[in-house]
Interface confidence: medium
């Protein structure tokens, strides 16, 4: 399990993965802007199996996926049923 918590730079991601995660395994993607003590944008992925992965924002697959999701987006539909707890 990839750990996601405070570091000395106040980034949440201790390490980031570039490994492709199929969209069908993803529940939620949280975008954290850079700044406030962390020099980079962070992308945290909650998988349907409840595990949490930090994804390298430069990974081509996540950039492509974000573009596809952005183009087909609908705001505030439907209410999430999961609890986004870091284990």
């Amino acid at each position: 399990v990839l750990e996601v918590y405070y570091t000395s730079l106040r980034c949440r991601c201790v390490q980031e993965s570039s490994v492709f995660i199929p969209r069908r395994f993803i529940d939620r993607i949280q975008i954290l802007p850079r700044g406030n003590g962390c020099p980079r944008k962070e992308i945290i992925v909650w998988k349907k199996n409840k595990s949490i992965v930090c994804v390298d924002p430069q990974a081509e697959w996540i950039q492509r996926m974000m573009e596809v999701l952005r183009k087909r987006s609908s705001s505030t539909l439907p209410v999430p049923v999961f609890k986004r707890k870091i284990p």
Epitope: Y6, R10, R28, N36, V68, L69, S75, L77, P80
Partner: antibody
Framework: EVQLVESGGGLVLPGRSLKLSCAAS????????MAWVRQAPKKGLEWVAT????????FYRDSVKGRFTISRDNAKSTLYLQMDSLRSEDTATYYC????????????????????WGQGTLVTVSS | DIRMTQSPASLSASLGETVNIECLTS??????LAWYQQKPGKFPQFLIY???SLQDGVPSRFSGSGSGTQYSLKINSLQSEDVATYFC?????????FGSGTELEIK
Amino acid sequence: EVQLVESGGGLVLPGRSLKLSCAASGFTFSDYAMAWVRQAPKKGLEWVATVFYDGSDTFYRDSVKGRFTISRDNAKSTLYLQMDSLRSEDTATYYCAREGDYYSRHVYVGYNWFPHWGQGTLVTVSS
Amino acid sequence: DIRMTQSPASLSASLGETVNIECLTSEDINSELAWYQQKPGKFPQFLIYNANSLQDGVPSRFSGSGSGTQYSLKINSLQSEDVATYFCQQYNSYPLTFGSGTELEIK
């Protein structure tokens, strides 16, 4: 229906403290980051602070760092802003706001925009 | 901090007209921009996210466009209920920042 109701505003002397609350309903509070945004009289909007959905991380604008503390009680679905060492430039209407997300191809994407706002509570810092 | 320069500061237009509000950012924000409408004495209402995606329930006469450092909000066929102040907001980096607002009135 998402509802955010702020309370705790009022007139306070410079250097004193005040604690704002925001009661949330109509959504799973513990699933969302929350923020405070303020608006000085006849002025624009100014982001103040954000707290992560589980309370584990907080983000502040430089001018309030060390003076303001954002926190949340997920069991009570309530957001707080503890304001210490208040200054006249902190005079504003303080809005509680919920982070946004969009739903696309069975995936939720969470972002720092604000689709839901409370009605605001006015804080006046004056002697 | 990313600076948001909004123009014009105020705007007067006739009913049925098309109006444009501009928002320039001090650096590329990768279309991570939202627009809000605030009517006098009310809290802000969310209109657009990701520069051009319309929030559910917002009339289709509102549209957003732009990329890089230049963004705009367009209101087609201006209605009396559109009288408000409009703000842009970037969420590309902390601190999150807003434009100074554009006050729209009917001629």
